[in-house]
């Protein structure tokens, strides 16, 4: 299996409740305006063939694909959680900067895009249906990164 | 298939310990979150604790935070739930649960039979 | 005390459908992300019926269906059968990193 290196997040920047509650809440008003709740980005079929010791390098592709392509464009709306919610995410992708795999990451490209795809497909609410998971991407990078 | 297995429940006095295990097979261990889930007799469910697939966070409902230690051992394919400091409504049957796909540990799509736990004098 | 509240009880004849509800005590169970709905008949541990709102695990019959409204998650079983009898618990993962449970709904087949 690849081995992937730097691919850590210090515990401490899990254990801020004031910012834990600011990205649930965020997530919570854009849920509330995705009426499409068949479609889940982030669950089995992101995850499926990728080994825990992998999880955090696909969980980064994820938050940078969010903060670049989804979060700054929509940064005007859902605030006033979306401007403290934002700097955080990124202050966690700058630190997730220098995690990589060695090896063939084929699999993790493949189910990244996957997700990519469908949040292009159903333009404007893809991007709602993403900001409304990031309590899904805190999650997921809180287990997999510590 | 999946198979979980408790054992270490027992009686016990008011402020005493006891450690739970939870023997694993079946699956990959240490591609999932692991939990203990309880319920008193006649009652309802009640989560424990959890704890993520490489044992780096370890969360604790309010109920038992101090006093219960969850932990793992991934080469023995083994959960444990050290609790301290009993007391009388700690009293249910422990089970030990697993996430229901690797990353959804807070979906418990596997359950073991559970280990009963008595608090009393 | 439950921090997620369902009806203690419901009934529906063979063939019905019943709804059971599940209300956060407060909002700040974010937007019910995580919401899971699991069957429990006496004596037995519990199964997981429905995951991520909606989806159901394989086996679970298409009978049981889940959706959520606001703060509000819900399950539906339709063309109720004897074998449907047992309770019903919902849950959701918090802001707070823990898993909370409703109190539990029996369903009673009348």
């Known amino acids: 299996a690849p081995i992937s290196s730097h691919c850590r997040l210090d515990k401490s920047n899990f254990q801020q409740p004031y910012i834990t509650n600011r990205t649930f809440m965020l997530a919570k008003e854009a849920s509330l305006a995705d009426n499409n709740t068949d479609v889940r980005l982030i669950g089995e079929k992101l995850f499926h063939g990728v080994s825990m010791s992998e999880r955090c390098y696909l969980m980064k592709q994820v938050l940078n694909f969010t903060l670049e392509e989804v979060l700054f464009p929509q940064s005007d709306r859902f605030q006033p959680y979306m401007q403290e919610v934002v700097p955080f995410l990124a202050r966690l992708s700058n630190r997730l900067s220098t995690c990589h795999i060695e090896g063939d990451d084929l699999h993790i490209q493949r189910n990244v895009q996957k997700l990519k795809d469908t949040v292009k497909k159903l333009g404007e609410s893809g991007e709602i249906k993403a900001i409304g998971e990031l309590d899904l991407l805190f999650m997921s990078l809180r287990n997999a990164c510590i | 298939e999946v198979q979980l297995v408790e054992s270490g429940g027992g009686v016990v006095r008011p402020g005493g310990s006891l450690r739970l295990s939870c023997a694993a097979s079946?699956?990959?261990?240490?591609?999932?979150?692991m939990n203990w889930v309880r319920q008193a007799p006649g009652k309802g469910l009640e989560w424990v604790s959890g704890?993520?697939?490489?044992?780096?966070?370890?969360d604790y409902a309010a109920s038992v935070k101090g006093r219960f230690t969850i932990s793992r051992d991934n080469a023995k394919n083994s959960l444990y739930l050290q609790m301290n400091s009993l007391r009388a409504e700690d009293t249910a049957l422990y089970h030990c649960?697993?996430?229901?796909?690797?990353?959804?540990?807070?979906?418990?799509?596997?359950w073991g039979r559970g280990t009963l736990v008595t608090v009393s004098s | 005390q439950a921090a997620l509240t369902q009806p203690a009880s419901v009934s529906g004849s063979p063939g019905q459908s019943i709804t059971i509800s599940c209300t956060g005590a407060s909002g700040d169970v974010g937007a019910y992300n995580f919401v899971s709905w699991y069957q429990q008949h006496p004596g037995k541990a519990p199964k997981l019926i429905i995951y991520?709102?909606?989806k159901r695990p394989s086996g679970v019959s298409n009978r049981f269906s889940g959706s959520k409204s606001g703060n509000t998650a819900s399950l539906t079983i339709s063309g109720l059968q004897a074998e449907d009898e047992a309770d019903y618990y919902c849950?959701?993962?918090?802001?707070?990193?823990?898993?909370?449970f409703g109190g539990g709904t029996k369903l009673t087949v009348l």
């Open positions: 991520d709102v909606n």
């Open positions: 704890v993520n697939w490489n044992g780096g966070t370890r």
């Open positions: 079946g699956f990959t261990f240490d591609d999932y979150g």
């Open positions: 849950s959701s993962y918090t802001s707070t990193f823990s898993v909370v």
């Open positions: 649960a697993r996430g229901w796909y690797s990353g959804s540990f807070y979906y418990f799509g596997y």
